[in-house]
Every structure is written in C-alpha cells, then in structure tokens.
C-alpha cells in the first residue's frame, strides 16, 4: 500500500487544533475490529498529527488505519477529507490488485508460507529478526508484542502463524521475503523439497 501514511498525515494536518482534539476523543470510543487494541489515552492526547499518523499505522497497519481515519472523519462530518482518503484507498487497491496478478498461480497451489508451516515453526530460529521486518507493515504493535512475549522460537512461530489466516498475499510475500533475508538456506532447502 504505502500511500496511506501520507494520506492520513495530510488529512490530520488539515484539521484545526480543536478538530484534532475531537478526532482523538472519537478515536478513543470508535468501534474497533476484533483483534485490534486501542491507542492508550494518555499517549494519544499528547500526540501531534505526525506522531498520531505513525501510531495509527503501527497499531492498525496502513489499510485499516486508513479506514479508521475515514470513519472518524465522516463521524465528525468532514466528508471532503474522508473522500480524499477513500480515493487513496481505491488507488491503493487498484495497485495491489495489479501487483498480485502474477502471483495467482502461487495462490492456487498454496503459498510457500502455508505449504511449509510445520517446517518453519520447527526450524526458524531468528524469529525476532523476522518480526522486526514485519512490524508496522504486516503485524500491528499488539501482534508484534504478543509474538515477542512467547519464550521459545517454536512458540513464537506458532503465535505468528495464528495471525496468518487473516493475511492477504502481500503479507505472506513479506514474510517470505523476511525469511529469505534471515534464513536464506532454510528457504532454499524448503523450496527444493
């Protein structure tokens, strides 16, 4: 996606001081999707637009962060700003769809990540490096911390895989890319098996 962060920042910076305060208050009460945590009130109220943008992206990822920002802006009656985010969302969707076309055959045969789940749980040792690569783009802050809280590499990988069912192809590709960088020989071995 990528553009969402800039679009959110533009929207928040285009709010007056009072509107930004109101946005934060609404963010504290807005209905969240299951599995997502709330940004702590104390920290939230002190944030400027740029900090809040980064926090929205790290807590909710770009796609849901964008959606959440749109929801709150609409709730505040700020249709113009919400519409601009909607345009960004649609543009990003089109880009993502175009980018995923070549990978359709992969989807039919099953992604590497799904095919080698058991082996990855058993054999990945540098889990923290993988997590750092996925933090903020694939994993929310809460998910990242939840995986890190596990004690063994296997338990960390099991926890990581518990989030995979909700991932799209781009997320799985990101995990594969991280594994290629951190465990190149393991990936090579599994690809040949």
């Amino acid at each position: 996606m990528g553009r969402a962060r800039d679009a959110i920042l533009d929207a928040l910076e285009n709010l007056s001081g009072d509107e930004l305060k109101k946005f934060k208050m609404k963010l504290l009460t807005v209905q969240l999707r299951e599995g997502y945590g709330r940004i702590p009130r104390g920290a939230l109220l002190q944030m400027d637009a740029i900090d809040l943008t980064d926090k929205l992206v790290s807590y909710y990822l770009e796609s849901y962060g964008l959606e959440l920002t749109m929801t709150v802006l609409r709730d505040m009656g700020l249709q113009e700003l919400a519409e601009q985010l909607q345009t960004t969302k649609e543009e990003s969707g089109a880009v993502a769809a175009a980018a995923s076309v070549p990978a359709q055959s992969t989807a039919r045969t099953g992604h590497f990540v799904d095919q080698h789940r058991q082996a990855l749980i058993a054999r990945v040792t540098e889990v923290d490096g993988v997590l750092d690569a996925l933090h903020g783009s694939v994993l929310t802050e809460g998910q990242y911390q939840a995986v890190r809280a596990e004690t063994t590499s296997q338990d960390k990988m099991r926890k990581l895989f518990s989030f995979v069912p909700s991932w799209n192809l781009t997320c799985k590709d990101s995990l594969l890319q991280a594994l290629k960088e951190i465990h190149p020989y393991l990936v090579m071995d599994l690809e040949q098996s």
Partner: antibody
Framework: QVQLQQSGVELARPGASVKLSCKAS????????ITWVKQRTGQGLEWIGV????????YYDEKFKGKATLTADKSSSTAYIELRSLTSEDSAVYFC?????WGQGTTLTVSS | QIVLTQSPAIMSASPGEKVTITCSAS?????MYWFQQKPGTSPKFWIY???NLASGVPARFSGSGSGTSYSLTISRMEAEDAATYYC?????????FGSGTKLEIK
C-alpha cells in the same frame, strides 16, 4: 490526479519581495498538502516548507523562516510563496508539489 | 533536523549493470521516498514508502532499507535511467532531501 500550474518567469530587484503562485486542479485542494522546494542552477533540492490549505498549518525549514511565507487561497485553489528581502542567493527555480505531483517550476532571477 | 547523506554523489554505469544508490539518515526514519530528475525538468515521484514504485516506474527499480540506512537499486541499467536521484524523509519536519546522486550512462 492533481495538476499544479505555476506562474511564469519572475524578475525582481535586490531587497524587493515577490509572490509566486501555484494553482491546483483535479482534486480537492483542502484535502492535501502543498510543499515548496528550491533548486539553484546545478544544485540539489531544498525543502522550504509545507502548507495544509484547510487548516493553514505551515511548517518551515529553519533556514527559510523569515525569508519565505506560505499561504493558500481556498476559493481559487491556489497556493503562494512570498519571498522577501531578495538577494542573488534567492535566484533559483521554485517548485510546488503535492504528495506525488510537481508543478513545472517558476524561475526567479534577482538582479539589479 | 534529519540530515540525509547520499552516496555516491556521481556515478556512471554501463547498460545492463546493477546500480545501487544509498541514503543514510542522521537519525532513524520510518520510510524513505525517492525522486528522479532529468535536466530542465521537474522531479518525478519515483519510489514511495521505502519500497513501492510510483505509477509508470519500470520494475527494474527497487527500494529497500529501514532505520537510518536506505537504498535504491536498478537491477539492469538502461540509458533512460541516467538522471539525478534524490531521497527524502517525511518522518519529521522539516521533510529534508538528500544531496542527490547523479547517475550517468557509460
């Protein structure tokens, strides 16, 4: 898609002030940001500052505080940069840009 | 303010050669942006949020990095890639640019 149309070549005397314009079309002016960038001949890009037209929030590079003032006229979807106390150091191409799109640039020449 | 240092300042590459331009930040940034500029024209938005190619950018370009170290790579240099490339951070005001890397074709 946003289009940005900048004013033409500007000639100014040392010590004078000048106001360059950047007219936006193709998207809601008050929903995004307008950034101004300076480029002297053969040199790199210098970030002057950014304005968010709906809120009039502005941020400047320290170097340009007191030299440049960014404003926006919502009714005409036009952003402006005013440069004051001009010297030959201000002779450059000035670009306006949104997140993804750039204007064609305005060449400012300061000469007596 | 965050200072971005690009290297090399000038480089030349033969057609088909792999090219890597680096951008080092004086403190950690969330993402990096890259622009391409050819003489007498406005800069073009090239890579956004570290690794996403802007519309119309050839797939031989890629971006990567995190923290204070970022790079733009061209897998196989082509004549049309000769230009000056600038990195930019948008993590903290002011949104500074790197000093630029002029890429020439051999």
């Amino acid at each position: 898609q946003v289009q940005l149309q900048q004013s033409g070549v500007e000639l100014a005397r040392p010590g004078a002030s000048v106001k360059l314009s950047c007219k936006a079309s193709g998207s809601t002016f008050t929903s995004y940001s307008i950034t101004w960038v300076k480029q002297r001949t053969g040199q790199g890009l210098e970030w002057i500052g950014v304005i968010y037209p709906r809120s009039d929030n502005t941020y400047y590079d320290e170097k340009f505080k007191g030299k440049a003032t960014l404003t926006a006229d919502k009714s005409s979807s036009t952003a402006y940069i005013e440069l004051r106390s001009l010297t030959s150091e201000d002779s450059a191409v000035y670009f306006c840009a949104t997140r993804d799109y750039w204007g064609q640039g305005t060449t400012l020449t300061v000469s007596s | 303010q965050i200072v971005l240092t690009q290297s090399p300042a000038i480089m030349s590459a033969s057609p088909g050669e792999k090219v890597t331009i680096t951008c080092s930040a004086s403190s950690s940034v969330s993402y990096m942006y890259w622009f391409q500029q050819k003489p007498g024209t406005s800069p073009k938005f090239w890579i956004y949020s570290t690794s996403n190619l802007a519309s119309g950018v050839p797939a031989r370009f890629s971006g990567s990095g995190s923290g204070t170290s970022y790079s733009l790579t061209i897998s196989r240099m082509e004549a049309e890639d000769a230009a000056t490339y600038y990195c930019q951070q948008r993590s903290n005001y002011p949104f500074t640019f790197g000093s630029g890397t002029k890429l020439e074709i051999k």
